[in-house]
Amino acid sequence: SEVEYRAEVGQNAYLPCFYTPAAPGNLVPVCWGKGACPVFECGNVVLRTDERDVNYWTSRYWLNGDFRKGDVSLTIENVTLADSGIYCCRIQIPGIMNDEKFNLKLVIKPAKVTPAPTRQRDFTAAFPRMLTTRGHGPAETQTLGSLPDINLTQISTLANELRDSRLANDLRDSGATIRIG
């Protein structure tokens, strides 16, 4: 039961994936692929990093965050309905079976005819760094977690946002937890 992310046609989609480098600049190869993570590789690769840099990418797919600090979240530019589906983020940690595999489901919705009210803004747009997946593979469940740099004020703000959010039920159903610290 992979975590679901949403975007509208014509918008940019954001698929979160993070790791913590052992030391600054000590990067780990990461690949993003369209389709669920296979046993060793990344499916149909759309972007790949090595120990130093992004060494392969395709149009519309890019890393908006600081990948040198472990933010390897994928941005897909100007999405269409064809971009819907499962995406694989694979963090290729050296060693024996150390890979972290994340399957993320992207749902693309038709563009709204009228803009949504301000309070109904997209959760992932309002709090893009709050959505992160924890390690899993086939037949494992994912949970949502938070990064350690979120303070109590942000948590309170987040709770207010969630109260009216379209995603509140989705987060509850996927076993979301907000961790402080």
Epitope: P29, V39, G95, M97, P138
Partner: antibody, heavy 119, light 111 residues
């Protein structure tokens, strides 16, 4: 044309070590997972090691702690270091290329190299 | 580990006849709608050759008389009309989980 050529097999005593090499050509080696699969005389196939394009390592319990796999993308080569060899490790060892984007099955194989563990 | 059981161990078939080989997995190899099962052919003194991947996809260059089917735990390799070059040992293999595992093989021999 894709080619995989194994070398390094031979006769070794129980407890000994051996290093097998696989020289690859005809494809962009760094993009593919590579595996070693063995076949004991008159027996079936057994997967023994894999290394992903990113360098992650995978082994079955039967060889974990005794075998290790490595790759040198600059030399288009993959290696299987076998330590603490046992009689039951006697087999033909094949180097195999994992299918691109997956790695978990094998679209090209080498001709194999025979490893005999005997005193 | 996922155990693959192939049957029969030996299949005696006349040239031109149809051959049906079975592979049963100890647990499902379905993953996001794909069956992670492959079939290989091996002739004496040769390396294995990939025939079928993801249960039913025929590898490039493999004759159309080879086909694969099945899902979940039960899979079948069918050779519609056996040719002399098809007499060999056939192995199934799962790529669902590490360790990757092979079936024990089915030997297809001339009747």
């Amino acid at each position: 044309e894709v080619q995989l050529v194994e070398s390094g097999g031979g006769l070794v005593q129980p407890g000994g070590s051996l290093r097998l090499s696989c020289a690859a050509s005809g494809f962009t080696f760094s993009r593919y997972a590579m595996s070693w699969v063995r076949q004991a005389p008159g027996k079936g196939l057994e997967w023994v090691a894999a290394i992903s394009s990113g360098g992650s390592l995978y082994f079955p319990d039967s060889v974990k702690g005794r075998f290790t796999i490595s790759r040198d993308n600059a030399k288009n080569s993959c290696y299987l270091q076998m330590n603490s060899l046992r009689a039951e490790d006697t087999a033909v060892y094949y180097c195999a290329r994992g299918r691109e984007a997956d790695g978990g099955y094998f679209d090209y194989w080498g001709q194999g190299t025979l490893v005999t563990v005997s005193s | 580990d996922i155990v693959l059981t192939q049957s029969p161990a030996t299949l005696s078939v006349s040239p031109g006849e149809r051959a049906t080989l079975s592979c049963r997995a100890s647990e499902s190899v379905e993953y996001y709608g794909t069956s992670l099962m492959q079939w290989y052919q091996q002739k004496p003194g040769q390396a294995p050759r990939l025939l079928i991947y993801a249960a039913s996809n025929v590898e490039s260059g493999v004759p159309a008389r080879f086909s694969g089917s099945g899902s979940g735990t039960d899979f079948t390799l069918t050779i519609s009309s056996l040719q002399s070059e098809d007499f060999a040992v056939y192995y199934c293999q799962q790529s669902m989980k590490v360790p990757l595992t092979f079936g024990g093989g089915t030997k297809v021999e001339i009747k």
